[in-house]
Amino acid sequence: ALDTNYCFRNLEENCCVRPLYIDFRQDLGWKWVHEPKGYYANFCSGPCPYLRSADTTHSTVLGLYNTLNPEASASPCCVPQDLEPLTILYYVGRTPKVEQLSNMVVKSCKCS
């Protein structure tokens, strides 16, 4: 699987999940988020050669087409597959509020 366990441990040029740390205050201007100060959002990148973690029959065909026709611009894209939520803490006045934000962390990627 093109997940963090594999991708973070290997020098992989093809489609894989890459580490990306986002600081809420510095990178997004979200000064009001109390915890965490930031998190690993991660992202997907890298080419999608034939049969690399193909998501659908269409992406398999597209990968094969791109392999047999290298000059063609059509090829599968490296996109998130599994995402996990992130829990944040902030204050409304002095009242703490905890929210779980869905689909915030990319855990694995696929070619689609």
Epitope: L28, G29, W30, K31, W32, Y90, V92, G93, T95, E99
Partner: antibody
Framework: EVQLVQSGAEVKKPGASVKVSCKTS????????MNWVRQAPGAGLDWMGQ????????NYNEMFEGRVTLTADTSTSTAYMELSSLRAGDIAVYYC??????????????WGQGTLVTVSS | DIVMTQTPPSLSVSPRETASISCRAS??????????MHWYLQKPGQSPQLLIY???NLESGVSDRFSGSGSGTDFTLRISRVEANDTGVYYC?????????FGQGTKLELK
Amino acid sequence: EVQLVQSGAEVKKPGASVKVSCKTSGYTFMTYWMNWVRQAPGAGLDWMGQIFPAWGSTNYNEMFEGRVTLTADTSTSTAYMELSSLRAGDIAVYYCARGYGNYALDAMDYWGQGTLVTVSS
Amino acid sequence: DIVMTQTPPSLSVSPRETASISCRASESVDSYGNSFMHWYLQKPGQSPQLLIYLASNLESGVSDRFSGSGSGTDFTLRISRVEANDTGVYYCQQNNEDPLTFGQGTKLELK
């Protein structure tokens, strides 16, 4: 230049709902909380609630008894306020106002021009 | 809810004089070393505009004739060398507690 441009005046019947829009420009919509404040004729300011557009988190003033719904469309950088079960006491000018940015509840540094809502049978 | 009480409800000031408006909170609006109190001016027919942030910080673009002071429950807005352009209704606002609340307003007019 930061701008908040609200939709035009509305006349509604008692019991109906009204939806006011607030189109923003000149800043990153998903970075700031958007507040809604109302002002009855000749009266002071009442905070209704707020929304964080990036994922739609909301905080409401209980004074409005769950009649207010705040939403945001990040594709058009527009915030919306819907008030249901309208009554005569809801006649007011409704303002959207951008939060200052340091806290969720905060001062408001930019305001829309206001939208007058009239309730009449 | 924190109740904000402004005094006086209205005042009439001669040009070039100093005007003072008081705002008292029903409980302290201080937390983490800040006073969560702000001041606005609403000119006739206009939207409110932020003047003072966190009790004493002048908002960008606002005349330095405006100044804010106070902590805890008692706050003051001072307007020195009052001009015709200063007329309108002044509001204080707290954000230390949910819900955010405003004072009832103080109407300033020129003599």
